[in-house]
Interface confidence: medium
């Protein structure tokens, strides 16, 4: 199946790259506006300039365009622990991120929350904390991994998955007790 082109894509495809077809006169190709600007008025005729105006404060366009309005700058979500990495400029949206020793957990495509990287206490760092992934820990002997924290095998109940990891430890304890009674 051939995907249908949208009206705007159809119109643009008639003109060479960097130009768009005049909405009222399809024989005219107008030059697109540079990033950081928006379309105020279409070019009056072939070879004549498109009237582009710079985006106002709080708005931007990040690529060449023929938008009638600039896009509103994103705001970092404080309730998600986000911090501003770089401010919005006329040609670039706000860049949001996390503080040092934190990683992003994406709840949806454009929505992330910042969480502290695990420290791997009672274990070692197997994989360092990344921008979008928590530290991966490996636990020392006598400890097992539960919710990415190293927990003592003394907290391991028979019904839990940790019994496999703590089995040598449990057998050692039993063995010591048995040898003490004979």
């Amino acid at each position: 199946l051939v995907p249908h082109l949208g009206d705007r894509e159809k119109r643009d495809s008639v003109c060479p790259q960097g130009k768009y077809i005049h909405p009222q006169n399809n024989s005219i190709c107008c030059t697109k506006c540079h990033k950081g600007t928006y379309l105020y008025n279409d070019c009056p005729g072939p070879g004549q300039d498109t009237d582009c105006r710079e985006c106002e404060s709080g708005s931007f366009t990040a690529s060449e365009n023929h938008l009638r309005h600039c896009l509103s700058c994103s705001k970092c979500r404080k309730e998600m622990g986000q911090v501003e990495i770089s401010s919005c400029t006329v040609d670039r949206d706000t860049v949001c991120g996390c503080r040092k020793n934190q990683y992003r957990h994406y709840w949806s495509e454009n929505l992330f929350q910042c969480f502290n990287c695990s420290l791997c206490l009672n274990g070692t760092v197997h994989l360092s904390c990344q921008e979008k992934q928590n530290t991966v820990c490996t636990c020392h002997a006598g400890f097992f991994l539960r919710e990415n924290e190293c927990v003592s095998c003394s907290n391991c109940k028979k019904s839990l998955e940790c019994t496999k990891l703590c089995l040598p430890q449990i057998e050692n304890v039993k063995g010591t007790e048995d040898s003490g009674t004979t």
């Epitope: 957990h105 709840w107 949806s108 495509e109 929350q113 969480f115 919710e147």
Partner: nanobody
């Protein structure tokens, strides 16, 4: 077929409690983040709470922080929302939502909703 079935809504007095449940089927529950969204009468959708696939990470809207607790039981394919100290402004239809499939990172499936009415 993905199905999300909410239950536990009802009429409750201010200061009271309710526990919502969401029974999930038709997908591998343990692999997905889940969330609760609500829509008050005449208002837009509001994210209430979200929980990661393993239950470790949670998000709460400021309006419910300290009063609501999200949890999940992956062995039962069920999502929960414990709502305490309920207020009149918590009156809404509460929806259970499943997160994205693959690269289409959006909450792609919603339940039918359960109505919570807080009134004296």
């Amino acid at each position: 077929e993905v199905q999300l079935l909410e239950s536990g809504g009802g009429l409750v007095q201010p200061g009271g409690s309710l526990r919502l449940s969401c029974a999930a089927s038709g997908f591998t529950f343990i692999e997905y983040d889940m969330g609760w969204v609500r829509q008050a009468p005449g208002k837009g959708l509001e994210w209430v709470s979200m929980i990661s696939s393993d239950g470790r990470l949670t998000y709460y809207a400021d309006s419910v922080k300290g009063r609501f607790t999200i949890s999940r039981d992956n062995s039962k394919n069920t999502l929960y929302l414990q709502m305490n100290s309920l207020r009149a402004e918590d009156t809404a239809v509460y929806y259970c939502a499943k997160t994205w499939d693959g690269l289409n990172r959006n909450f792609d499936y919603w339940g039918q909703g359960t109505l919570v009415t807080v009134s004296s």
